[in-house]
């Protein structure tokens, strides 16, 4: 699996997740979380070269197609395949909140 | 949506579905495939700035991080939404069979 | 087994103090933010304190402010709730909630009933 496991234990340059980290008010100016500062929510990149974890089977197509016409621009893409929530603390007024945010975390990548 | 009503009509630069015809025997050697002799699998590309068609949480941050770190390397990446089947003709020996193989055809697309 | 026990509620004075404990096992505790809730009859539950890890500061519901004071070893894997200056509005049952930052896992513990009353 293209996972944080096996990703972020090689040097891989096809389609893997890689590490990214995000803090809520210097990289998006989100200033209303107030907790954490920060988290990993990671990002999927590199090539899909065929049958590399293909999602269906159009991207099966797609990394056949691209395989034999390599000048073609349709390819598949690295994109999230599992992800996770993210647990914050926010203000309503002067009441605080803690809320959980699905599919924050990318914790896999699929070629789609 | 960005899907074949609108992106075949229109000259959209960002993410949306394109036209691709795929020759089955030309384009991906696959002899045993008797009808149709090939088909539009389409395919997905173009940028996908902040917002546009954000598939979850994750790709709506990614976005808005990479239009406000528009150095970084992390982006959302315009994949397929909604596949459809395709019915083929081929033979087992000398009996032919009539089958649907799944996800075959790019519908629409989204920032994943 | 994951498991959230709570204790040191009790019935206690106007303007007393009590110590609420919370200790958790089962799971890695260093992970999770701790918060403590409450919910008075009749009412909804809600936040009273948080704490995030590995060293966010506390966040409390304006009520408590300056009386209400939470903290956390790690190492114990439990979360305290310190109660001074008790006012019969805190009278309540206080949960210890502890949810996972990064992933999924969100637990409870059972309860513990604090009466503020002369």
């Known amino acids: 699996a293209l996972d944080t496991n096996y990703c972020f234990r090689n040097l891989e340059e096809n389609c893997c997740v890689r590490p990214l980290y995000i803090d809520f008010r210097q990289d998006l100016g989100w200033k209303w979380v107030h907790e954490p500062k920060g988290y990993y929510a990671n990002f999927c990149s590199g090539p899909c070269p065929y049958l590399r974890s293909a999602d269906t089977t159009h991207s099966t197509v797609l990394g056949l197609y691209n395989t034999l016409n390599p000048e073609a621009s349709a390819s598949p893409c690295c994109v999230p395949q599992d992800l996770e929530p993210l647990t914050i603390l926010y203000y309503v007024g002067r009441t605080p909140k803690v809320e959980q945010l699905s599919n924050m975390v990318v914790k896999s990548c699929k070629c789609s | 949506a960005l899907d074949t009503n609108y992106c075949f009509r229109n000259l959209e630069e960002n993410c949306c579905v394109r036209p691709l015809y795929i020759d089955f025997r030309q384009d991906l050697g696959w002899k045993w495939v008797h009808e149709p002799k090939g088909y539009y699998a389409n395919f997905c590309s173009g940028p996908c700035p902040y917002l546009r068609s954000a598939d979850t949480t994750h790709s709506t941050v990614l976005g808005l991080y990479n239009t406000l770190n528009p150095e970084a390397s992390a982006s959302p990446c315009c994949v397929p939404q909604d596949l459809e089947p395709l019915t083929i003709l081929y033979y087992v020996g000398r009996t032919p069979k009539v089958e649907q193989l799944s996800n075959m055809v790019v519908k629409s697309c989204k920032c994943s | 087994e994951v498991q959230l026990v709570e204790s040191g509620g009790g019935l206690v004075q106007p303007g007393g103090s009590l110590r609420l404990s919370c200790a958790a096992s089962?799971?890695?505790?260093?992970?999770?933010?701790a918060s403590w809730y409450r919910q008075a009859p009749g009412k909804e539950r809600e936040l009273v304190a948080t704490?995030?890890?590995?060293?966010?500061?506390?966040h409390y519901a304006d009520s408590v402010k300056g009386r209400f004071a939470i903290s956390r070893d790690n190492a114990k894997n439990t979360v305290f709730l310190q109660m001074d200056s008790l006012k019969s509005e805190d009278t309540a049952v206080y949960y210890c909630?502890?949810?996972?930052?990064?992933?999924?896992?969100?637990?409870w513990g059972q309860g513990t009933q604090v009466t503020v009353s002369s």
């Open positions: 089962g799971f890695t505790f260093s992970y999770y933010v």
């Open positions: 704490t995030f890890p590995p060293d966010g500061s506390p």
């Open positions: 909630n502890a949810r996972r930052v990064e992933g999924h896992g969100i637990y």
